[in-house]
């Protein structure tokens, strides 16, 4: 019997999407590239439920983790990597006093129980997101033996 598995190995399913929490660290731009290499996107948050899920993953592992949000295009104007602006209701997730742009901090990370802005050239963990496979279609992903992970091989 073939079991349907909506996400590749080592990815986590949540509300119709697959998420990969990296085990290595890269700067923000390289994190974008790493996600693109596996057909995903550095995570763009669309709902409070998704934010709560991701914040929990990040805080549980006690890691500073990049998300797909920056104000690189225009200082103070935060934009997701899909081009959409940071919406009003998501501003509540910034940690107290953030974003503060101390020393050109233009990229957003999960930090503790909220978000922080930090220097984009710093190496941090990252989260990729892509749509889950539908189990009713031909291209469904059945427990593949080859994990698709956007991590470089160990040195």
């Amino acid at each position: 019997e073939r079991l349907c598995h909506p996400c590749p190995w080592e990815w986590t399913f949540f509300q119709g999407n697959c998420y990969f929490m990296s085990n290595s660290q890269r700067n923000w731009h390289d994190s974008i590239t790493a996600c693109k290499e596996v057909g995903a996107q550095l995570v763009v948050i669309k709902s409070a439920e998704e934010q709560n899920f991701l914040q929990l993953q990040s805080s549980r592992s006690n890691r500073f983790t990049w998300m797909g949000l920056s104000d690189l295009n225009q200082e103070g104007t935060w934009q997701w990597v899909d081009g959409s602006p940071l919406l009003p209701s998501f501003k509540q997730y910034w940690n107290r006093g953030e974003p503060n742009n101390v020393g050109e901090e233009d990229c957003a990370e999960f930090s503790g129980n909220g978000w922080n802005d930090d220097k984009c050239n710093l190496a941090k963990f990252w989260i990729c997101k892509k749509s889950a496979a539908s189990c009713s279609r031909d291209e469904e992903q059945f427990l593949s033996p080859a994990p698709a992970t956007p991590n470089p091989p160990p040195a």
Epitope: K46, S47, E50, D82, P85, P88, S89, K91, Q92
Partner: antibody, heavy 119, light 112 residues
Framework: QVTLRESGPALVKPTQTLTLTCTFS??????????VSWIRQPPGKALEWLAL???????YYSTSLKTRLTISKDTSKNQVVLTMTNMDPVDTATYYC???????????WGQGTMVTVSS | QSVLTQPPSVSGAPGQRVTISCTGS?????????VHWYQQLPGTAPKLLIY???NRPSGVPDRFSGSKSGTSASLAITGLQAEDEADYYC???????????FGGGTKLTVLG
């Protein structure tokens, strides 16, 4: 009790600039999480979102009308102002202001003001 | 043409159950953005009926319920009453348009 009230001209001529004022009470636009939006509805047609301003003074505009719209706020007067340039008869509509609290739902609306564009 | 597609009209007899669909795409409902529903009685401003997919503001009867799945959402009204006759609009956010979007509206007629 949250209330919003729109005011402005009932009639404008083509090519003129429309200025609408939303005066509200029962909440403050300096409170985190609060936003005010403008939405319009041509006679017998659907609702169309135009612009939004939040407590942080960040402004959001409809892509198709961005070049014609300006939204601003006067927190001390509890007012939000929308200006729309180069008015055309197709802009004839009822214009509403509405509050948006968290989660992006418009939870309180003004009664609307009808604006006719005609020469 | 609205970004969110609703049937132009639905009807039902008093006491019946009707549903109104709202179909979007991967850049709005399918992306995970919340869906809200509004009721607009004739000659009045819209009123929030359902927020965040399935929640009712205080004062809205439990005859009204909302749900969301994939790229679509739906509003269900049970025990239809004459005063439910109105236009109903769904609303979400669209990341491609970078703006809030409404459905084209559905006119509910209560028969009899």
């Amino acid at each position: 009790q949250v209330t919003l009230r729109e005011s402005g001209p009932a009639l404008v001529k083509p090519t003129q600039t429309l200025t609408l004022t939303c005066t509200f009470s029962g909440f403050s636009l300096s409170t985190s999480g609060m936003s005010v939006s403008w939405i319009r509805q041509p006679p017998g047609k659907a609702l169309e979102w135009l612009a939004l301003i939040d407590w942080d003074d960040d402004k959001y505009y409809s892509t198709s009308l961005k070049t014609r719209l300006t939204i601003s706020k006067d927190t001390s007067k509890n007012q939000v102002v929308l200006t729309m340039t180069n008015m055309d008869p197709v802009d004839t509509a009822t214009y509403y202001c509405a509050r948006m609290a968290l989660r992006h739902a418009f939870d309180a609306w003004g009664q609307g003001t009808m604006v006719t564009v005609s020469s | 043409q609205s970004v969110l597609t609703q049937p132009p009209s639905v009807s039902g007899a008093p006491g019946q159950r009707v549903t109104i669909s709202c179909t979007g795409s991967s850049s709005n409902i399918g992306a995970g953005y919340d869906v809200h529903w509004y009721q607009q009685l004739p000659g009045t401003a819209p009123k929030l009926l359902i927020y965040v997919n399935s929640n009712r503001p205080s004062g809205v009867p439990d005859r009204f319920s909302g749900s969301k799945s994939g790229t679509s959402a739906s509003l269900a009204i049970t025990g239809l009453q004459a005063e439910d006759e109105a236009d109903y609009y769904c609303q979400s956010y669209d990341s491609s348009l970078s703006g809030w979007v409404f459905g084209g509206g559905t006119k509910l007629t209560v028969l009899g």
